[in-house]
Interface confidence: medium
């Protein structure tokens, strides 16, 4: 390449508990940093599908060090969803950044090197308000199911025993 290229680093920051409790909304923030040049496209994906509703992205990348002529760039974007949607640990959120540059191995030629697209992503899973993660949520569901089945089994056994005792009592009463 004619000029050095730096792909972005991407991170997703989860919404704050304060925002969720006060507004019943949840804002996820995506931050792409350290890229050069400033040719990027950012998109949000929820459960594998690209979303546009509730998305607010900076109009253009900003220099990380404005005073420097050759500063790397950063770009931020926000995705706002309802608190209940965020608190469902089955929901998957992904911020994807497409970076247009030349890969380290591409040779720059006099007729220009063909730019390549690098995709860098970061993700987050919904988080229940009691601090469940997706894994602990699944484990919790499993535990709850087992507990329910045990209680149901106990109740059934109890019902059978009570029924048996009632029947026995009725038979004894007929004998008298």
């Amino acid at each position: 390449d004619l000029n050095k290229v730096f792909p972005p680093e991407v991170a997703v920051f989860e919404p704050s508990e304060a925002e969720i409790s006060h507004t019943q909304k949840a804002t996820l923030v995506c931050l792409a940093t350290g890229f050069f040049p400033d040719h990027v496209e950012l998109s949000w994906w929820v459960n594998g599908k690209e979303v546009h509703s509730g998305v607010s992205t900076d109009p253009q990348p900003l220099k990380e060090q404005p005073a420097l002529n050759d500063s790397r760039y950063c770009l931020s974007s926000r995705l706002r969803v309802s608190a209940t949607f965020w608190q469902n640990p089955r929901n998957h959120f992904r911020c994807q950044v497409q970076f247009y540059g030349l890969s380290e191995n591409d040779e720059w030629t006099q007729d220009r090197a063909k730019p390549v697209t690098q995709i860098v992503s970061a993700e987050a899973w919904g988080r229940a308000d009691c601090g469940f993660t997706s894994v602990s949520y699944q484990q919790g569901v499993l535990s709850a199911t087992i507990l329910y089945e045990i209680l149901l089994g106990k109740a059934t056994l109890y019902a059978v025993l009570v029924s048996a005792l009632v029947l026995m009592a009725m038979v004894k009463r007929k004998d008298f």
């Epitope: 000029n3 050069f36 002529n69 050759d70 247009y100 220009r112 090197a113 730019p115």
Partner: antibody, heavy 120, light 111 residues
Framework: QVQLVESGGGVVQPGRSLRLSCAAS????????MHWVRQAPGKGLEWVAV????????YYADSVKGRFTISRDNSKNTLYLQMNSLRAEDTAVYYC?????????????WGQGTLVTVSS | DIVMTQTPHSLSVTPGQPASISCKSS???????????LYWYLQKPGQPPQLLIY???NRFSGVPDRFSGSGSGTDFTLKISRVEAEDVGVYYC????????FGQGTKVDIK
């Protein structure tokens, strides 16, 4: 601040050699492609040569190919132009220029230039 | 080689009036990445050139908004909405889709 300073110009006889230098400061020299552009007295601009940020790729205008060599020393933040077999038509002000960055193309920073006169 | 042709060769403008410079390339400057590699420079008397416009229409940092670039393919225009005394000099267009070629320049002075 961002600065490019050329040196090494002067009067030289046809067929002789000259080496121009360009000292860079105020930016990360090793991240950018660098160019030499010249301007004959009273004439327009003519691009001469380019070198990639790491020195691995070099290209030249047909008018200087085989005679001029562009090089760089990133440890010294310096760009060079070795000019051999000089001709009268090489007489010009030689500017070094920094590439704008990205996929390349524009020259965003220029030096003040150094005059090379080829004359017997 | 790509040839860049500028018109007019020179231009005399009254301060406050608009000015327009045309630049034509011998082949399209649109590249496969969707960008058009056409640039405008101004060389003021006794100074090195300075970048005004990159990729057809983007003003370089610090360039006044009275300068604007337009065009596509092979035909491009630089416009100065209201010429000021400090705008005098020679304007060059340049392509960088296949190495680098400048137009022959357009000299702008004040009436």
């Amino acid at each position: 601040q961002v600065q490019l300073v050329e040196s090494g110009g002067g009067v030289v006889q046809p067929g002789r050699s000259l080496r121009l230098s360009c000292a860079a400061s105020g930016f990360t020299f090793s991240s950018y492609g660098m160019h030499w552009v010249r301007q004959a007295p009273g004439k327009g601009l003519e691009w001469v040569a380019v070198i990639s940020y790491d020195g691995s790729n070099k290209y030249y205008a047909d008018s200087v190919k085989g005679r001029f060599t562009i090089s760089r020393d990133n440890s010294k933040n310096t760009l060079y132009l070795q000019m051999n077999s000089l001709r009268a038509e090489d007489t010009a002000v030689y500017y070094c220029a920094k590439d704008l960055g990205g996929s390349g193309g524009a020259f965003d920073i220029w030096g003040q230039g150094t005059l090379v006169t080829v004359s017997s | 080689d790509i040839v860049m042709t500028q018109t007019p060769h020179s231009l005399s403008v009254t301060p406050g009036q608009p000015a327009s410079i045309s630049c034509k390339s011998s082949q399209s400057l649109l590249y496969s990445d969707g960008k058009t590699y056409l640039y405008w420079y101004l060389q003021k008397p006794g100074q090195p050139p300075q970048l005004l416009i990159y990729e057809v229409s983007n003003r370089f940092s610090g360039v006044p908004d009275r300068f604007s670039g337009s065009g596509s393919g092979t035909d491009f225009t630089l416009k100065i909405s209201r010429v000021e005394a400090e705008d005098v000099g020679v304007y060059y267009c340049m392509q960088s889709i296949q190495l680098y070629t400048f137009g022959q320049g357009t000299k702008v002075d004040i009436k």
